[in-house]
Amino acid sequence: VLHYVVCFPALTEGYVGALHENRHGSAVQIRRRKASGDPYWAYSGAYGPEHWVTSSVSCGGRHQSPIDILDQYARVGEEYQELQLDGFDNESSNKTWMKNTGKTVAILLKDDYFVSGAGLPGRFKAEKVEFHWGHSNGSAGSEHSINGRRFPVEMQIFFYNPDDFDSFQTAISENRIIGAMAIFFQVSPRDNSALDPIIHGLKGVVHHEKETFLDPFVLRDLLPASLGSYYRYTGSLTTPPCSEIVEWIVFRRPVPISYHQLEAFYSIFTTEQQDHVKSVEYLRNNFRPQQRLHDRVVSKSAVRDSWNHDMTDFLENPLGTEASKVCSSPPIHMKVQPLNQTALQVSWSQPETIYHPPIMNYMISYSWTKNEDEKEKTFTKDSDKDLKATISHVSPDSLYLFRVQAVCRNDMRSDFSQTMLFQANTTRI
């Protein structure tokens, strides 16, 4: 008879920690309970963005970020002239470090970088850099967008006014104005060597709470070549507490990044909490859904000649955009449960982001190993509503791996879901 089952998500090899090595060489961490602490939040699930307001009331405010910027409705603001950057051309010192916070990868800046102009009320000092990205293949990962077009990565640089506050954290805790720059990364065929120190750093912070010192880099080289075309609006932090204190500068032109370099972002892990248990998962799609503009106006810079080149050079290039790659983010919330001694039920939830709706059906693939033989089957679930499938004739002494993929209208596919392993152990009673 079926005595007990073990069911857990499969991770990639080489995770350091409390791992069980399965026979396919995948490393798996058994889920652990969350320790109590600060209000927990996540980018999906029970602690996802729609629930942030329960612990951070500002997240329900009317001046939230990020937003979609519609260029034709942005009005030129004569006060938004050239940015003055100071220290951005210097190489960073060896004290600059990177940390995997579990929600993003942050660069903690230890040198003096100052920005003024662009309507900022004073001379602001750069404190940190954070990144937001998608799930794979250059899929949409930016928080802001222009005319509905999102980018694979958004880099955000946060600033505070050192004349008013002794630290960035003080400015936030006192709900005072901070500045933020948003820089889009767009896929290009070649590596961007300016990003090499960042990409190298990412490989040192693959796991949650890891930290590493960064090789020297030039912050100016991480910004667009032309800084003259930017948008300005007043918004919020894009993570709890969502304080509405941010003067946003969103650069229209992107910075190039290769697919190869993007992979470093997609290889980052986090620790997620769902149903009172923790699991190690990839940190992907770490962006907040876009917020309503309400009564705000988006302005655009008045820098002479900066808007002359049309956006078509990057906005209409399908290379690397989600449109050319995958139809949705992966199906989520994979579960495998025994129905009886010879049948299993696989269930999942629809992808969180669908780039090319609608999803027409789902492909369920499962493989198993018995007597050193590996077999695989795939079948289609013709539904966008009933997201479960029954697997019959399950062998009780085999290890099963399940994964699900969405199929969209244009026959494009999503990425595969997290792979679930299922082991049914048999014991004579």
Epitope: L70, Q72, Y73, N147, G148, R149, E316, P318, A323, S324, Q350, P351, T353, I354, Y355, H356, P357, P358, I359, M360, N361, T380, D382, S383, D384, K385, D386, V407, C408, R409, N410, D411, M412, R413
Partner: antibody, heavy 117, light 111 residues
């Protein structure tokens, strides 16, 4: 605000090709799919077809080559050889982007095509 | 191809609750949407994904689904609710695709 408007509807004789145009405002046609829907006088809504952001098209089973959807900066519906049964108000509608199902949340006011000899 | 079946007409007294149905085998596995169309106007999306209401749609309108039937319920019917109501859904595979409207229900509010 985002909006769509149809034009090109008029009285035509059977067999005379006619192209209707859907002009959009504030909508990025490389991101959104646009459908054409028609409604004969006193009858219900009838989906004709859709063109998505990448330019792929799908048509209702009954269309069978009678209509062609294309786009540039506008979305066009060509009625290749109109018959009297094609007399209807033709609507252009924007699909809701990013939803798990397809819904039309922005519609134009419609343009009337009358096919008569 | 499949057909969504709706009653041709339904009457409701002012202030009462009325339910409009839409039936098709495909609705057991596909989500339904509901549109309202008043004479001489374009349709307006009322309900999507069986139960969800777009912003701006009064909460008197609600959707539900069970088995192969989707239902639009209007509670506290008002004179302004007099209109044609269409259910709709999509179906197909990755390479084929259809969007289908029901025949529509003409709602008359009396009293």
């Amino acid at each position: 605000a985002q909006s769509v408007e149809e034009s090109g509807g008029r009285l035509v004789t059977p067999g005379t090709p006619l192209t209707l145009t859907c002009t959009v405002s504030g909508i990025d046609l490389s991101s959104y799919a646009m459908s054409w829907v028609r409604q004969a006088p006193g009858k219900g809504l009838e989906w004709i077809g859709v063109i998505d952001g990448s330019g792929s098209t799908w048509y209702a089973n009954w269309v069978k080559g009678r209509f062609t959807i294309s786009k540039t900066t506008t979305v066009d519906l060509k009625i290749t050889s109109p018959t009297t049964e094609d007399t209807a108000t033709y609507f252009c509608a924007r699909e809701d982007y990013g939803s798990e199902t397809i819904d039309f949340n922005i519609w134009g006011p419609g343009t009337l095509v009358t096919v008569s000899s | 191809s499949f057909v969504l079946t709706q009653p041709a007409s339904v009457q409701v007294n002012l202030g009462q609750t009325v339910s409009l149905t839409c039936t098709a085998d495909t609705l057991s596995r596909r989500y339904a949407s509901w549109y309202q169309q008043k004479p001489g106007q374009a349709p307006v999306l009322l309900i999507y994904r069986d139960t969800r209401r777009p912003s701006g749609v009064p909460d008197r309108f609600s959707g539900s689904s069970s088995g192969n039937t989707a239902t639009l319920t209007i509670s506290g019917a008002q004179a302004g609710d007099e209109a044609d109501y269409y259910c709709a859904t999509s179906d197909g595979s990755g390479s084929s695709y259809q969007y289908v409207f029901g025949g529509g229900t003409q709602l008359t509010v009396t009293g």
